[in-house]
């Protein structure tokens, strides 16, 4: 397509940047504003800086969950992440257990034995 | 707060979220999806374990996760918005949010790395 | 086992600069940081920095002052500008195989270089 000789013509075209880029972050900056928007009220507005701020939060979250769920498969000598690696890494720490109250589908249960049931050495339950 | 195990409302914003369905009248109806972070849970992954794989019900388990902080998130900024009369959301109100919904330890180190994203996008502008 | 050796404490007059060292041996740890326990007071966290993906994460009392690096002989250095008296204290370098700053913050599962003196007058 031809475009007209503009004052710009000369200068080379500057690549475009992605919010997401411009924050320094994976997570979808554009993506995530117009999702805010979708979720407040007709007359509500949504800054710039309120989506940035989300999906930075979506991403460290992410980036925790993720950490010790690998750390979980590594433990396990096994070089994929599955729902037992994510139900492990989650049940394990109080501070993503209180967050997470939903159950992971495929997680199985979390290895406790109740310390009343532990017997003492040499002391055998008779039949 | 519990997450809610309910269908998500529909996302009006959202055109990939969103499918047709045929209704009996011809008309056609928007049923709702949840929006999909894949791509972006995996490409936080391969930061944190560049050697490490995911299976797609692990995947898939991060994705309901993300959605369902976002809900959390975006809810609890929009109350407060609301009950603050203010008309625009800013990164202020998620700050609050967050703060509000993440635990301890959890609720500092993301208010640390929200407000770290917003200097350097605004530095950068 | 984790070995960690700290260095490049001393005395520094109030306004000036310091960088602290901590190489880290042994078994792989995922990130690195430094507390600090000034005299009669508490052990405190002062900075970690992941080391795969490099976050960073800093206490309030020195964040724009102090920056955590690392570099790919894992070792981690703390850049002390602006010092004030009360940075004064012993500095510890600490690890922890989880790469997460806020567990590193907690203190609870780290391992722990020797002491290095940080005296601000």
């Known amino acids: 397509a031809g475009g007209k000789a503009g004052k710009d013509s000369g200068k080379a075209k500057t690549k475009a940047v992605s919010r997401s880029q411009r924050a320094g972050l994976q997570f979808p900056v554009g993506r995530i504003h117009r999702h805010l928007k979708s979720r407040t009220t007709s007359h509500g507005r949504v800054g710039a800086t309120a989506a940035v701020y989300s999906a930075a939060i979506l991403e460290y979250l992410t980036a925790e969950v993720l950490e010790l769920a690998g750390n979980a498969s590594k433990d396990l000598k096994v070089k994929r992440i599955t729902p037992r690696h994510l139900q492990l890494a989650i049940r394990g720490d109080e501070e993503l257990d209180s967050l997470i109250k939903a159950t992971i589908a495929g997680g199985g249960v979390i290895p406790h034995i109740h310390k009343s049931l532990i017997g003492k050495k040499g002391q055998q339950k008779t039949v | 707060p519990e997450p809610a195990k309910s269908a998500p409302a529909p996302k009006k914003g959202s055109k990939k979220a969103v499918t047709k369905a045929q209704k009996k009248d011809g008309k056609k109806r928007k049923r709702s999806r949840k929006e999909s972070y894949s791509v972006y849970v995996y490409k936080v992954l391969k930061q944190v374990h560049p050697d490490t794989g995911i299976s797609s019900k692990a995947m898939g388990i991060m994705n309901s996760f993300v959605n369902d902080i976002f809900e959390r998130i975006a809810g609890e900024a929009s109350r407060l918005a609301h009950y603050n009369k203010r008309s625009t959301i800013t990164s202020r109100e998620i700050q609050t949010a967050v703060r509000l919904l993440l635990p301890g330890e959890l609720a500092k180190h993301a208010v640390s790395e929200g407000t770290k994203a917003v200097t350097k996008y605004t530095s950068s502008k | 086992q984790v070995q960690l050796q700290a260095s490049g404490g001393g005395l520094v007059q109030a306004g000036g600069s310091l960088r602290l060292s901590c190489a880290a041996s042994?078994?792989?740890?995922?990130?690195l940081g430094w507390f600090r326990q000034a005299p009669g007071k508490e052990r405190e966290f002062v900075a970690g920095i992941t080391w795969t993906a490099g976050r960073t994460y800093y206490a309030d009392s020195v964040k724009g002052r102090f920056t955590i690096s690392r570099d790919n002989k894992r070792t981690t250095y703390l850049q002390m500008n602006s010092l004030k008296p009360e940075d004064t204290g012993v500095y510890y370098c600490a690890a922890t195989s989880s790469g997460s700053t806020r567990l590193l913050s907690t203190g609870r599962d780290n391992y722990w270089g020797q002491g290095t003196l940080v005296t601000v007058s």
């Open positions: 042994g078994r792989t740890v995922a990130t």
